[in-house]
């Protein structure tokens, strides 16, 4: 070949300036012997570009571009041949920036699949490819001191969430966590956690279900509803506190909120509703007094109140 | 010191009945599900039944359900065990157990042998 | 009822050796399996919860691995105070069965 670019840096900031140098060796005899060296990035001429003969024949052109401002483009150097340019060689430029410290950690541990998931925001676009590692480590106390290194957590392309699996991680022990972010500008990293898997257990939640109707219970009092739940099996060893939405299937009623409820009630009577009307009912659930993460709302449950208008308003529980 | 410690076993005729106690020091004993475990002379570990912290729950092996019944007195700090019709392969040691919130059994008493035979 | 199945039900080994024992459950239990060594006359010990959680206290020879229905104990080097019965656990189902035991004799 006959050209060879050279740059300061092929990946620099954004704005920030770069500097190229095109040698043309002496043996392309086939070229005019005071050739004029053009510069192109993209598809448009630079001007600025300095050019002498070194002593050794070969001919040299400096250009400085003062911003690089495109994220991405070829920086080509050229000369006229004919009535075309003939490209000597080209480089890819790259521009962008460091990687912000990825913010807004946070991990759950699910028990089902037996692994810790942790989430981040990785912050502002870099324009340069940018990988994200999630780091940990085991602490017999508060993580000031490291035990033993957890394997990284690479997650895929584009993902912003990783998961721990159960073989890395020590239940009812600290670990240190952190997210490293990196590219060829520069590595940040998140503010350190640390947590013990528990803590942040998210638990599924119980099963909704209408109470069966026995003979020996009372039938519900107008403008009350009788239900009852089923918990997650796994999770019943584990404290919890539980509460219940309900809303008006019809209407634009918000959410009303009832709880604390032990899950070990099981049953439940709730009154002081609309009679003759369609209710919509949720339940969720949180280790307690320990802590742990709500876990997602349960699957709806639809239940209708009796016809007769309520004569009083009351909250009642059944143990 | 934690520990757990099982009482009321004995030698019980056919079709009688027995209770034993589990008194429990060390630990915040509200706060824990607590179960039965026995063991038959020469044989291995059958879970018995299991008891919610408040009590609430109450789950029993199929061999159990209908005669025993399994209760808490968080104020005493002490499990029971009320074993009613019993019969002879009810024979065994029967352990006092702490569980934890997998459902493990992080802490045994000693045992206590119960026998029912004529 | 998920039943719990142990194998082998006893074996013999030296002090030294690597010792394996399997569990596996008749139905998906996630990694709710715990192992408990047992010595005569004695309580049950908990060794290890959760599939691979050891107990503390409990040496690092022991270690526990495998999720959904299949289980393994591995002792990494057989110390004398190791011969006993081994148990596992499971507790995804609030019933809580425990396999038959495995009986690790000195050969």
């Known amino acids: 070949e006959c050209g060879h670019i050279s740059v300061s840096a092929p990946i620099v900031h954004l704005g920030d300036p770069i500097t190229a140098s095109c040698i043309i060796k002496q043996n392309c005899s086939h070229l005019d012997p005071e050739p004029q060296i053009l510069w192109r990035l993209g598809a448009e001429l630079q001007p600025g570009g300095r050019q002498q003969r070194l002593s050794d024949g070969t001919q040299e052109s400096i250009i400085t571009l003062p911003h690089l401002n495109h994220t991405q483009a070829f920086l080509s150097c050229a000369l006229n041949w004919g009535n075309s340019l003939q490209i000597l060689d080209q480089v890819e430029l790259r521009a962008g920036y460091p990687p912000a410290i990825p913010h807004n950690l946070s991990c759950l541990m699910n028990l089902t699949t037996s692994s810790l998931i942790c989430q981040w925001e990785p912050g502002p676009e870099t324009h340069l490819p940018t990988s994200f590692t999630l780091k940990s480590f085991k602490s017999r106390g508060n993580c000031q001191t490291q035990g033993d290194s957890i394997l990284d957590c690479v997650p895929k392309d584009g993902q912003s969430h990783c998961s721990i699996p159960r073989k890395h991680l020590l239940l009812y022990q600290n670990m240190g966590i952190w997210v490293q972010a990196e590219n060829a500008l520069g590595t940040s990293m998140s503010p350190q956690l640390c947590l013990d898997p528990m803590d942040v257990v998210k638990l599924e939640p119980p099963m909704l279900r209408t109470m069966d109707p026995s003979p020996e219970a009372a039938p519900p009092q107008a403008g009350c509803l009788q239900l009852s739940w089923e918990p997650w099996q796994p999770g019943l060893h584990i404290n919890q506190k539980c509460e219940l939405r309900h809303k008006p299937q019809r209407g634009e009623a918000s959410w009303a909120l009832v709880g604390p409820l032990p899950l070990e009630a099981l049953q439940y009577e709730l009154c002081g509703l609309l009679p003759a009307t369609a209710y919509t009912l949720q339940i969720r659930c949180i280790r307690w007094p320990l802590p742990g993460h709500w876990s997602d709302w349960s699957p709806s449950l639809e239940l209708r109140t009796t016809e007769r208008a309520p004569t009083h308003h009351h909250h009642h529980h059944h143990h | 010191e934690v520990q757990l410690l099982e009482s009321g076993g004995g030698l019980v005729q056919p079709g009688g009945s027995l209770r034993l106690s589990c008194a429990a020091s060390?630990?915040?004993?509200?706060?824990?599900?607590m179960g039965w475990v026995r063991q038959a002379p020469g044989k291995g570990l059958e879970w018995v039944s299991s008891?919610?912290?408040?009590?609430?729950?109450?789950p029993y092996a199929d061999s159990v359900k209908g005669r025993f019944t399994i209760s808490r007195d968080n104020s005493k700090n002490t499990l029971y065990l009320q074993m009613n019709s019993l019969r002879a392969e009810d024979t065994a040691v029967y352990y006092c157990a702490k569980l934890g919130e997998l459902g493990q059994s992080m802490l045994w008493g000693q045992g206590t042998l119960v026998t029912v035979s004529s | 009822d998920i039943q719990m199945t142990q194998s082998p039900s006893s074996l013999s080994a030296s002090v030294g050796d690597r010792v394996t024992i399997t569990c596996r459950a008749s139905?998906?239990?996630?990694?709710?399996l715990n192992w408990y060594q047992q010595k005569p006359g004695k309580a049950p010990k908990l060794l290890i919860y959760y599939a691979s959680n050891l107990q503390n206290g409990v040496p690092s020879r022991f270690s526990g691995s495998g999720s959904g229905t299949d289980f393994t104990l591995t002792i990494s080097s057989l110390q004398p105070e190791d011969f006993a019965t081994y148990y596992c656990?499971?507790?995804?189902?609030?019933?809580?069965?425990f396999g038959g035991g495995t009986k690790v004799e000195i050969k």
């Open positions: 060390g630990f915040t004993f509200s706060l824990y599900w």
């Open positions: 139905q998906g239990i996630s990694s709710y």
């Open positions: 008891i919610s912290s408040s009590g609430g729950v109450t």
């Open positions: 656990q499971q507790s995804w189902q609030i019933k809580l069965k």
